[in-house]
Amino acid sequence: ELCDDDPPEIPHATFKAMAYKEGTMLNCECKRGFRRIKSGSLYMLCTGNSSHSSWDNQCQCTSSATRNTTKQVTPQPEEQKERKTTEMQSPMQPVDQASLPGHCREPPPWENEATERIYHFVVGQMVYYQCVQGYRALHRGPAESVCKMTHGKTRWTQPQLICTGEMETSQFPGEEKPQASPEGRPESETSCLVTTTDFQIQTEMAATMETSIFTTEYQ
């Protein structure tokens, strides 16, 4: 079942999912100047069985200047450079959490996708928190949140994490280097926008992995 609400917001912290449970939706969103093709998929869906899960449907974007066409527009070098600024290196995760039964890896990017990924989580999904750059974590317990079903309603558990304003950065499990963090957003924002990192889980041969920072909405 889909989770009604967003994962809790922790001051000066971001969260991410290491893997996505079956039933998770990722909206097919396109960057400015592009739109989802008219008969294109509305969303990608993590689907499968206990032994193998994958993302169903493909997102396709077309230039909004080109009406009712499925023409794929290749980003200009300038646009590619702009996208590249959100990527950086980070150490490999110690556990390939996407190999968990009933879970999907981070879906690969599609051409001209929006810089903001909009996921819709399902019951049982876990997200992990870390303090943004310039803040240090004070743990009172697990820095994670799980969407649970209680009395027919969904709710997220409260992560036990406080981020204090010291120039050290707490990392996700197994990470050693600090990651760049996005600009702080206005506190008045009521749209449930959250910043999270998207992980391309690598094979054991890979020494590093690319991590893109997305502003992601979960409503």
Partner: antibody, heavy 114, light 107 residues
Framework: QVQLQQSGAELVRPGTSVKISCKAS????????LGWVKQRPGHGLEWIGD????????NYNEKFKGKATLTADTSSSTAYMQLSSLTSEDSAVYFC???????WGQGTSLTVSS | DIVMTQSQKFMSTSVGDRVSVTCKAS??????VAWYQQKPGQSPKALIY???YRYSGVPDRFTGSGSGTDFTLTISNVQSEDLAEYFC?????????FGGGTKLEMK
Amino acid sequence: QVQLQQSGAELVRPGTSVKISCKASGYTFTNYWLGWVKQRPGHGLEWIGDIYPGGGYTNYNEKFKGKATLTADTSSSTAYMQLSSLTSEDSAVYFCARVTPASWGQGTSLTVSS
Amino acid sequence: DIVMTQSQKFMSTSVGDRVSVTCKASQNVGTNVAWYQQKPGQSPKALIYSASYRYSGVPDRFTGSGSGTDFTLTISNVQSEDLAEYFCQQYNSYPYTFGGGTKLEMK
């Protein structure tokens, strides 16, 4: 919680136009496609079209091209559907609906009568 | 346009029964099918997305299944509050189209 609040019932004359509103709350209005659906007894549900407020992009069911015009005001998180050259065939309940994950407004009853 | 056919306009049932509402698409729509419940004077309420996944708050007695052209909404252990009209919808191809509806009635 996602909510779509539609404007009240309308009684209008044939040949005129009407504009129905749908105010969204509980989510980021600009990030989701919002559709409009017509329901008439004996005719079931018909998809009129949809709009992406973030870019003003629209899709229309061919059947409703020239009849319906979809717009959105991002400053007030409100979507609008204007129906023109009204006839008795346009008498129906009209729903706005966030396309996915689906969430529907309460409906607006339109009666076209002289 | 893709035609969604719900062959049974009415279905009679009793509390505690198991009932299956069927829907057939005129062409392959994959699993891009949703099911809605509508009670008199109310707007449709989304029950199922992607043919088989439940929306939050939807009791687990509602189960969706199928892919391609044939889809089923099964209600096990029918409750009195389940008496309503049920619609399928495809969103695989534009324009999105709905089935004609199946009204669940008490025997």
